[in-house]
């Protein structure tokens, strides 16, 4: 009478190794009948199913990179890792299988290594503007982090404008520079019993941006679109706003308007409004960052067009709702044709389907929300602007809704803003 037995892993052992150590071996023993075969994997890598460098001896298999070797003999399998790296640390699973069944068991490899540091080496700020210098640390066992300035341990009485915050994975040096002296080098040093590492950071005084350059101006009767290139130098910190200044030729006073940098940079266009028809204007641009307003560009001249009467069609941009069957259609006002826009008219439908009732939006609206749309359907939207003189040409936008999810969120009817 032959009695078969399911595999059972009878022995595994956790291991500890040092980084750059020559090798470490993990062992897995199993019982069972027929004799089980043993395979190895980690949470990210199926070692046993990888292509091997050598199949000449099935009892010894080496990975292509030569980093791991699996040896099997009867009921015992070993996994040897060569030239240990700190990324080798973690869970290793051995699985014993035969025709009756299988069994798996985890073991853990702990790799001890000297600290490794990283972070953005150059950090920009300006006097009075608080900034964090981030020193990310990878170490096992965990490291002690110290900050130095000119060899002096921080914080110190000489540097009252400095604070230090530590988390398990990083140390943050919070600096509020109050003079020229606070800019320069800062040293982050991490120490554990395996070793130490230092990383030099430099705190750089940000500058104001250089001037944007005006490419071309597209004038209408009461507005103009100014197309520009971003400043070549941002000063090391993000540009926050653009400032447009314009005046009619012969006038002394410049009119001005601020524009959000993200919106303006997306299209590289700012629109100036409230212009007189058939008038020559000069326009110039400057960029603002946290440090301050940068140098102003050379002025560019243009002449507005005669009154056209009806407005220009708005530009349309769509943002699909997270629910997948709604959309926010942004209306970007263009030229009003010389008289104020009274309202926008919106019509939309699923293609090849019925038109929804027309939506009338007040002149100040900058978007319309279309909700409760059909799933996985193509829609078209038309919008006109209307002033006292008449309607603009229709602006057009096509989009597709998402495929229907399993759970449908509740929705309302179209709304405007």
């Amino acid at each position: 009478l032959k009695v078969f037995a399911k595999p059972k892993i009878t022995y595994v052992e956790n291991q500890t190794a040092m980084e750059l150590e020559e090798q470490v071996t993990l062992t897995c023993e199993a019982s069972g009948d027929p004799i089980p075969s043993i395979t190895w994997r980690t949470s990210t890598r199926n070692i046993s199913s990888e292509e091997k460098a050598s199949w000449t001896r099935p009892e010894k298999q080496e990975t292509l990179d030569g980093h791991m070797v699996v040896r099997s003999h009867a009921r015992v399998s070993s996994l040897t890792l060569k030239s240990i790296q700190y990324t080798d640390a973690g869970e290793y699973i051995c699985t014993a299988s035969n025709t009756i069944g299988q069994d798996s068991q985890s073991m853990y490899l702990e790799v001890q290594y000297a600290p490794k540091l990283q972070g953005p080496v150059a950090v920009y700020t300006w006097e009075g503007n608080q900034v964090n210098i981030t020193c990310e640390v990878f170490a096992y066992p965990s490291a002690t982090i110290s900050w130095f300035r000119d060899g002096q341990l921080l914080p110190s009485s000489n540097y009252s404008n400095i604070k230090i915050y530590n988390t398990p994975s990083a140390s943050y040096l919070e600096v509020t520079p109050d003079s020229e002296n606070d800019f320069g080098n800062y040293n982050c040093t991490a120490v554990n019993r395996i070793g130490q590492e230092s990383l030099e950071f430099i705190l750089v005084q940000a500058d104001t941006p250089s001037s944007p350059s005006i490419d071309q101006v597209e004038p209408y009767s009461s507005t103009a679109q100014v197309q520009f290139d971003e400043p070549e130098a941002t000063g090391g910190v993000p540009i926050l706003k653009y400032k447009a200044e314009w005046r009619a030729v012969g006038e002394e006073v410049w009119h001005s308007k601020w524009y959000d940098a993200k919106e303006a940079s997306m299209e590289g266009i700012v629109t100036i409004v409230g212009l007189k028809p058939e008038t020559t204007y000069a326009v110039r641009l400057a960029a603002l960052n946290g440090k301050g307003l940068g140098e102003i560009s050379a002025a560019s001249e243009f002449k507005t067009q005669p009154v056209q009467g009806e407005p220009s069609a708005p530009k349309l941009e769509g943002q699909m709702g997270e629910d997948g069957n709604s959309i926010k259609v942004n209306l970007i006002k263009q030229d009003d044709g010389g008289s104020p826009i009274r309202h926008y008219l919106v019509r939309y439908r699923a293609l090849s389907s019925e038109w929804k009732p027309e939506i009338r939006l007040p002149s100040g609206s900058d978007h319309v929300m279309l909700k409760s749309l059909d799933w996985n359907a193509e829609y078209e939207v038309y919008v006109v602007a209307e002033n006292q003189q008449g309607k603009s040409k229709a602006a057009h936008f096509v989009f597709r809704t998402s495929a229907q999810p399993t759970a449908i969120p509740a929705n309302g009817s179209p709304t405007s803003g």
Epitope: L345, R347, L351, S352, S353, E354, W355, P357, E358, E378, E380, Y382, V384, K391, K393, A394, H396, V398
Partner: antibody, heavy 124, light 106 residues
Framework: QVQLQQSGPGLVKPSQTLSLTCAIS??????????WNWIRQSPSRGLEWLGR?????????DYAVSVKSRITINPDTSKNQFSLQLNSVTPEDTAVYYC??????????????WGQGTMVTVSS | EIVLTQSPATLSLSPGERATLSCRAS??????LAWYQQKPGQAPRLLIY???NRATGIPARFSGSGSGTDFTLTISSVQAEDVGVYYC????????FGQGTKVEIK
């Protein structure tokens, strides 16, 4: 000034295919603010919409249920025209056939421009 | 499909009289309704769109009203050249036409 000029035979034999063309001047068949339609008129059925073609980043066609299995409307961008093909015609298809524009650009939506009409007789 | 019913079938008027033509939809078409005039041997001509907007070049004596299911075309003072058949048409969904109202001068 937009004009639609129709062309095609006035006599078609039963079971054959009726083919008409509508040439556009002053507008584009590829406009995303227009749709190009075929409509017919007979004493028994009155005015009957047959179908349309329109471009909205790709080409679309809508057809009347009554002729869906027999109709094809095709745009021809190189000649700025569109055509009607109606297969397997019977004497019931005898009518005046019109092409017409639906004008969205001017927010008119209805059929603002019509062709001159083509009288098509289906007879052996 | 949306059915449009026009009344009356024929309207006989003296010049200068007011003409009122009616169009009723089998379901709501919002304001997506047009009126056309057709003279013998000619293609229909657009008079009114969106229920109440006069098309380019249409005389002010033509006006439209209504929304939903009930619509009216009014000719404030009928002229001899206004004779013909008048059709309503909806474009809310698949386009359909009414059967027409014939306007004649007494």
């Amino acid at each position: 000034q937009v004009q639609l000029q129709q062309s095609g035979p006035g006599l078609v034999k039963p079971s054959q295919t009726l083919s008409l063309t509508c040439a556009i001047s002053g507008d584009s068949v590829s406009s995303n603010s227009a749709a190009w339609n075929w409509i017919r008129q007979s004493p028994s059925r009155g005015l009957e919409w047959l179908g349309r073609t329109y471009y909205r980043s790709k080409w679309y066609n809508d057809y009347a249920v009554s002729v869906k299995s027999r109709i094809t409307i095709n745009p021809d961008t190189s000649k700025n025209q569109f055509s009607l093909q109606l297969n397997s015609v019977t004497p019931e298809d005898t009518a005046v056939y019109y092409c017409a524009r639906e004008n969205i650009a001017a927010w008119t939506w209805a059929f603002d421009i019509w062709g001159q009409g083509t009288m098509v007789t289906v007879s052996s | 499909e949306i059915v449009l019913t026009q009344s009356p079938a024929t309207l006989s008027l003296s010049p200068g009289e007011r003409a009122t033509l009616s169009c009723r939809a089998s379901q709501s078409v919002s304001s997506y309704l047009a009126w056309y005039q057709q003279k013998p041997g000619q293609a229909p001509r657009l008079l009114i769109y969106d229920a109440s907007n006069r098309a380019t070049g249409i005389p002010a004596r033509f006006s439209g009203s209504g929304s939903g299911t009930d619509f009216t075309l009014t000719i404030s003072s009928v002229q001899a050249e206004d004779v013909g058949v008048y059709y309503c048409q909806q474009y809310h969904g698949t386009p359909t036409f009414g059967q027409g109202t014939k306007v004649e001068i007494k």
